[in-house]
């Protein structure tokens, strides 16, 4: 293979470098649905973008196999700490792959974020952020979820959102 | 446009790609300035550099357009919490564009730190990290703004910093 | 140096490409040693991975110099305060370089989590996410350290890790 | 400056199709989104869809699902509008606009499609 | 989804400030920061005046002032002039990568 034929293959890889794969979804009002699914995204309008991965059902999918960063924050806030609300809050980001039924956990935290209120009254917030590296195969699923999602403020995109991109 | 033309073109991406803009600044006592304004950051000291983005008054100015992984972390720490201050601290990465001329929120984060502390005279610490992908046009400006800033605590750029690289 | 040459440059340039440098070491009950030395990692098993950099004690060792996007996570947690734990949970990366006998500060983070605590025997949970691009040589290796290491909750290797790759 | 430039006026017959472009200039075109608005005479706006010109995906808005297609060519920059089976109701003026977040800036001047036997 | 309220009409003499309402739900208007106001003289396309309930892009003028209280949102002119006769449209984010149109509102100038 001289050459010409790397020619091509050096013309290709270049113009799929050119999109790298990379998303940022961001969070809205029908981010979360309550029924124990993963928290939903919206994926074109805003800072919202997909470029070379899909989308489906609150989940990021790959196209291209590879090494990927994944990433995702979320605003928590509550007033105090009501009463059967767990006083544990985890966030995680899971992974779907055909071959095994059961989401695989990639990245999580948990928080006691409640706690931080003095009074049963009191208004408090915190922020969940999680990234790292994990190698995702083509058809692989990527979602968020945080238990218990009642606890998740949404506003404008900017405060909850979940992405990705190729290393 | 045959393989001659193509070859000075590849020649040309392999370099630019040498210097795909990444940038890391970092706290400095200087860094909050008390007047409404965004963080200012040290450039070119320490861990802090500049590769392919430039800097202007706190922002982190792009040259080249494209997709941008954007990151932030601030120390916050106090006594107790004092009177006067908020018991919300927000902070966020905000874009500068020449046709919007007020601040667009890209990444935002809210958080009640103060409510940590059992007594008003403890010291506390918390720390707020902001990480995501959003699409810069040359000349657009990145700045971080931190409200309340005087909770901020800065010591030797490691604990307070603000950096983008391109995906 | 001709288009022949070059070429051979960039077919090496698009192999080394190919192996961006990328880690990602996961928490395992090993990771603690109590010995006042940096938390060791899982290189191998589950979600953790080395691909152009390698792992000794405790530390990523770069082998191609460059600037690296590096980060970690620990996730905290306890029961109340305990005396004789700090009040103050200090999560760094930091660097080790021949030319230097002491580690340098890289990338750190101060919290106070115990406080969120209202009594005594409340159970708690925290996460800390450090993240940031540092310049690294050849040789240079980085390390997590987290003082009090006796808070870091590890199960799984999803709640605490280790990870950098070049931008 | 940016600048979204569009075709000219068309005329055409009830049960054709017809399509419109938009160039655009100004900015990086693949990063935004291209939105297609028609405005009926004497009428309000009416958001038709649009297409993210990074990933061609689109949306578009419910009544005009099946007889509407929007495409962009990122070589030159131009985003087109097609619109089958023409109807009489069809006659209105129409815009393309940058998408830009959760905005329209800046628009296009407009191409006025007239449906007429 | 149904369009956004707007009044059909609404005037107002040289000088004077008027308002010009949206009305929408908690999913739309209330629910986000990302309401936009147009302005659209006749055979002339629209052109941006208000973006994020508040903010003006450049160019604009200061006259101009958007705001917003639970699911309204308002469009004020102040000072009004002659040529700010024309059609406003408001816009509103409503989620699932949905954009709603007002109805639009006739401003005449007395």
């Known amino acids: 293979d001289g050459p010409a034929g790397s020619w091509e293959q050096l013309i290709q890889e270049r113009r799929s470098h050119e999109v790298n794969p990379a998303a940022h979804l961001t969070g809205a009002n029908s981010s979360l649905t309550g029924s124990g699914g993963p928290l939903l995204w919206e994926t074109q309008l805003g800072l919202a973008f997909l470029r070379g991965l899909s989308y489906h059902d609150g989940a990021l999918v790959v196209t291209k196999a590879g090494y990927y960063y994944i990433y995702s924050k979320v605003q928590l806030g509550g007033v105090g700490c009501p009463l059967g609300l767990a006083s544990t809050i985890t966030h995680g980001l899971y992974k779907r792959t055909p071959r095994y039924p059961e989401e695989l956990e990639l990245l999580v935290s948990q928080q006691s974020p409640c706690g931080r209120a003095t009074s049963s009254s009191r208004v408090w917030w915190d922020s969940s952020f999680l990234g790292g590296v994990v190698h995702l195969e083509a058809g692989e699923k990527v979602v968020v979820r945080v238990l218990d999602e009642r606890l998740v403020r949404l506003r404008d995109g900017t405060r909850s959102y979940f992405g990705a991109f190729m290393v | 446009d045959g393989p001659a033309g193509s070859w000075e073109q590849l020649i040309q991406e392999r370099r630019s790609h040498e210097v795909n803009p990444a940038a890391h600044l970092t706290g400095a006592n200087s860094s909050l300035t008390g007047s409404g304004g965004p963080l200012l950051w040290e450039t070119q000291l320490g861990l802090a550099f500049l590769r392919g983005l430039s800097y202007h008054d706190g922002a982190l100015v792009v040259t080249k357009a494209g997709y941008y992984y954007i990151y932030s972390k601030v120390q916050l720490g106090g006594v107790g919490c004092p009177l006067g201050l908020a018991s919300t601290i927000t902070h966020g990465l905000y874009k500068r564009t020449p046709r919007y001329p007020e601040e667009l929120e890209l990444l935002v984060s809210q958080q009640s730190p103060c409510g940590r502390a059992t007594s008003s005279s403890r010291v506390w610490w918390d720390s707020s990290f902001l990480g995501g992908v959003v699409h810069l046009e040359a000349g657009e400006k990145v700045v971080v703004r931190v409200l309340d800033e005087r909770l901020v605590r800065l010591r030797d750029g490691t604990r307070s910093y603000f950096g983008a690289f391109m995906v | 140096d001709g288009p022949a040459g070059s070429w051979e440059q960039l077919i090496q340039e698009r192999r080394s490409h190919e192996v961006n440098p990328a880690a990602h070491l996961t928490g395992a009950n090993s990771s603690l040693t109590g010995s006042g030395g940096p938390l060791l990692w899982e290189t191998q098993l589950g979600l953790a991975f080395l691909r152009g950099l390698s792992y000794h004690d405790g530390a990523l060792v770069v082998t191609k110099a460059g600037y690296y996007y590096i980060y970690s996570k620990v996730q905290l947690g306890g029961v109340g305060c305990p005396l004789g734990l700090a009040s103050t949970i200090t999560h760094g990366l930091y660097k080790r370089t021949p030319r230097y006998p002491e580690e340098l500060e890289l990338l750190v983070s101060q919290q106070s989590p115990c406080g969120r605590a209202t009594s005594s025997s409340r159970v708690w949970w925290d996460s800390s996410f450090l993240g940031g691009v540092v310049h690294l040589e050849a040789g240079e290796k980085v390390v997590v350290r987290v003082l009090d290491e006796r808070l870091v909750r590890l199960r799984d290797g999803t709640r605490s890790y280790f990870g950098a790759f070049m931008v | 400056q940016v600048q979204l430039v569009q075709s000219g006026a068309e005329v055409k017959k009830p049960g054709a199709s017809v399509k419109v472009s938009c160039k655009a200039s100004?900015?990086?075109?693949?990063?935004?989104?291209i939105s297609w608005v028609r405005q009926a005479p004497g009428q309000g706006l009416e958001w038709m869809g649009w297409?993210?010109?990074?990933?061609?995906?689109?949306n578009y808005a419910q009544k005009l699902q099946g007889r509407v297609t929007m495409t962009t060519d990122t070589s030159t920059s131009t985003a087109y509008m097609e619109l089958r089976s023409l109807r009489s109701d069809d006659t209105a003026m129409y815009y393309c606009?940058?998408?830009?977040?959760?905005?329209?800036?800046?628009w296009g001047q407009g191409t006025l499609v007239t449906v007429s036997s | 989804q149904s369009a956004l309220t707007q009044p059909a009409s609404v005037s107002g003499s040289p000088g004077q400030s008027i308002t010009i309402s949206c009305t929408g739900t908690?999913?739309?208007?209330?629910?986000?920061?990302?309401v936009s106001w147009y302005q659209q003289h006749p055979g002339k396309a629209p052109k941006l005046m208000i973006y994020d309930v508040s903010k003006r892009p450049s160019g604009v003028s200061n006259r101009f002032s958007g705001s917003k209280s639970g699911n309204t949102a308002s469009l004020t002119i102040s000072g009004l002039q002659a040529e700010d006769e024309a059609d406003y449209y408001c816009c509103s984010y409503a989620g699932s990568s949905t954009l709603l149109f007002g109805g639009g509102t006739k401003l005449t100038v007395l």
């Open positions: 297409i993210s010109a990074h990933n061609a995906n689109t």
């Open positions: 606009a940058r998408l830009y977040r959760n905005w329209f800036d800046p």
């Open positions: 908690s999913s739309d208007v209330g629910g986000y920061n990302y």
């Open positions: 100004g900015y990086t075109f693949t990063s935004y989104g």
